[in-house]
Interface confidence: low
């Protein structure tokens, strides 16, 4: 599996999409997990509804939500109030029994606020002398990592 990069802005929500073959994964629940180390386990963050027919219902765990379009074949994960510590490797999974197939490997990168023109940690809007805790990009920029490319999340 290639790794797809999704970039979001600190404090904003980020949407991650994982397309899949709806026929191949018919009847299967899905999950979103965080990779613990390069070869470590993938720790479950949130999974779709226990009843597969209700997979379209959004389920939350803390600031992470999951919803599944089982007909269209798209799993969508929303990370609200994105923080630098959310950066890292994740997986979208299709569950069957105690097994899990990887649908997509995802690298989440957390960018500084796009309106933060200063080097300091304060988040700022152009023309302001005060700092504001500002954040706003749901503009999931996604790209695939090339083989051997080292992910370096540009966190601030």
């Amino acid at each position: 599996h290639n790794t797809t990069v999704f970039q979001g802005v600190a404090g904003q929500s980020l949407q991650v999409s994982c397309p899949y073959d709806s026929m191949k994964h018919w009847g299967r629940r899905k999950a979103w997990c965080r990779q613990l180390g390069e070869k470590g386990p993938c720790q479950r963050v949130v999974s779709t509804h226990n009843l597969w027919l209700l997979s379209f219902l959004r389920r939350w765990n803390g600031s992470t939500a999951i919803t599944d379009d089982t007909l269209g074949g798209t799993l969508t994960i929303t990370l609200r109030n994105l923080q630098p510590h959310d950066a890292g490797l994740y997986q979208c999974q299709s569950l069957h029994g105690s097994e899990a197939d990887t649908l997509r490997k995802v690298l989440v990168e957390v960018l500084a606020d796009p309106l933060d023109h200063r080097d300091a940690g304060d988040l700022w809007f152009p023309g302001e002398s005060e700092s504001f805790e500002d954040a706003h990009v749901e503009h999931s920029i996604s790209r695939s990592l090339l083989e051997g490319e080292i992910p370096f999340p540009p966190t601030s």
């Epitope: 023109h117 809007f125 152009p126 023309g127 805790e133 500002d134 954040a135 706003h136 749901e138 503009h139």
Partner: antibody
């Protein structure tokens, strides 16, 4: 899919008022800064103002060209952005756009025409 | 206010060839953090502007890699390689360094 749909434009006499609206969908409206931008026929866009997100109290900034006459507000329960325009002048004739603000104006509505004429 | 000045394209560009659109700012848009706060937009005939480039050279989501931005603190270029019919329209640069945000007057791209 992000969608912005403006309404409320039309013909108004000099000195009159109009309230423009922008219905937003496809994203978490309260998380984003939103702007109004206008474009006179055949000319470049002009940024009018911005309203911050919920985390920053929906506070506003304006271009000096409209400050005191135009007011931006938002109804976050209905996902609607508003622009109240007062004491309109002939030079305010333009297409008015609402736009989402991220690294720039990443999504724009289709625009609504405001004509100020007697 | 920062004034943005755009140059005109002298002639219609032959389809398949490249086009370069220039923009100048009255003040450097290069910040001490290393980013240059210059955006590009395309407004196709009868449509709203579309976000193309931010931070001078970063393509917005979904924008073709035929579009590339470059420049210094005050002089900027948008290059469109292998122009196609869908590239026709008016291109605007915009400074994002300080309020009020200001746009250039626009550069019209026509194709032969």
């Amino acid at each position: 899919e992000v969608k912005l749909l403006e309404s409320g434009g039309g013909l108004v006499q000099p000195g009159g008022s109009l309230r423009l609206s922008c219905a937003a969908s496809g994203f978490t409206f309260t998380d984003f800064y939103m702007s109004w931008i206008r474009q006179p026929p055949g000319k470049a866009p002009e940024w009018l103002g911005v309203i911050r997100n919920k985390a920053n109290g929906f506070t506003t900034e304006y271009n000096t060209s409209v400050k005191g006459r135009f007011t931006i507000s938002r109804d976050y329960t209905q996902n609607i952005l508003h622009l109240q325009t007062n004491t309109l002048r002939a030079e305010d004739t333009a297409i008015y756009y609402c736009a989402r603000l991220t690294y720039g104006f990443d999504y724009w509505g289709q625009g609504v025409m405001v004509t100020v004429s007697s | 206010d920062i004034v943005m000045t755009q140059g005109a394209l002298p002639n219609p560009v032959p389809s398949g060839e490249s086009a370069s659109i220039t923009c100048q700012s009255s003040k450097s848009l290069l910040h001490s953090n290393g980013k240059t706060y210059l955006n590009w937009y395309l407004q196709r005939p009868g449509q709203s502007p579309q976000f193309l480039i931010y931070w001078m050279s970063t393509r917005a989501s979904g924008v073709s890699d035929r579009f590339s931005g470059s420049g210094s603190g005050t002089d900027f270029t948008l290059k469109i390689s292998s122009v196609e019919a869908e590239d026709v329209g008016v291109y605007y640069c915009q400074q994002f360094l300080e309020l009020p945000f200001t746009f250039g007057s626009g550069t019209k791209l026509e194709i032969k």
